[in-house]
């Protein structure tokens, strides 16, 4: 039975040209995390595999950095980066947990972080 929950950074905003950390945290389970995928609806950004390490998709190599931890740092943000991002935690023995982050990239210099929230 899947008892865990994913906590994410929730709805976040950042300035164009700046950088942002996408972060998820799996709690309330003793399941072992074996892989984490970072995805958009139509493309994979990066994978962190317990045995193989990090893999960054070639289309993001210049502006995506692994970490901190299992998170992902997006750099040189453009307005086209606005949208949903998913962290997909592959675990044993529970299965797959998913968290969702909505990023808004702003032209303005005012970019405040949204509140944290949980996805079961």
């Amino acid at each position: 039975m899947m008892t865990g929950t994913i906590e994410t950074t929730g709805n976040i905003s950042a300035e164009k040209g700046g950088s942002i950390i996408l972060q998820c945290h799996l709690s309330s389970t003793t399941a072992q995390v074996t892989q984490v995928n970072w995805e958009q609806q139509d493309q994979l950004l990066a994978i962190c595999n317990a045995d193989l390490g990090w893999h960054i998709s070639p289309s993001f190599k210049d502006r995506v950095a692994p970490g901190p931890g299992l998170g992902l740092t997006l750099q040189s943000l453009t307005v086209n980066d606005t949208g949903e991002y998913f962290c997909i935690y592959h675990t044993y023995p529970d299965g797959t947990y998913t968290g969702r982050i909505f990023l808004e990239v702003l032209e303005s210099s005012v970019a405040e972080h949204g509140a944290r929230f949980q996805i079961p």
């Epitope: 892989q35 609806q41 139509d42 994979l44 193989l52 893999h55």
Partner: antibody, heavy 118, light 107 residues
Amino acid sequence: DVQLQESGPGLVKPSQSLSLTCTVTGYSITSDYAWNWIRQFPGNKLEWMGYISYSGNTRYNPSLKSRISITRDTSKNQFFLQFNSVTTEDTATYYCSRKYYGSWFPYWGQGTLVTVSA
Amino acid sequence: DIVMTQSHKFMSTSVGDRVSITCKASQDVFTAVAWYQQKPGQSPKLLIYSASYRYTGVPDRFTGSGSGTDFTFTISSVQAEDLAVYYCQQHYSTPWTFGGGTRLEIK
């Protein structure tokens, strides 16, 4: 549990347009996920055609982009494939499918066979 | 587009045997490969995603392995009901693409 059911004309003439409907039960197409069309040619080859996401965004296979459109009717919990200028090469079984965030396909309809013939 | 090649169109095996089906990607897809089973007259059914993770309810005789460009799907002890066509799919980048399929025949 979510169920998907395709419906369509069965037989279409070359150069005509094809319209297919996917009716989803057990889950609202506006709640989450991306809702896809995938076709399977007579030789068994599978081809991903495109999707419409729960928020209404669409993404198409570049090889088909100029000929297809995916839309939806949220009140009926249906999404549609509009396929223009079909040829005999478009004869296939057409499936609708719900994609997981990681872009694998856990849920499929039963498929509807479309034959393009004069 | 990423081309997924299943070199064997047909494989023949006996009940109880171990059988492995291979799939090769035209470029590095890390671990972003899924496997499907399609029985006669049915739609494809997801078995494996992310190269090695069994989907919910899939028997543990089905396993997947591999990374980069070379992937393997294995049935440890073939059952009569495993008669089907098996497809790999890359979920690395759009357009998502499938292998041509390997038909498993039971002797």
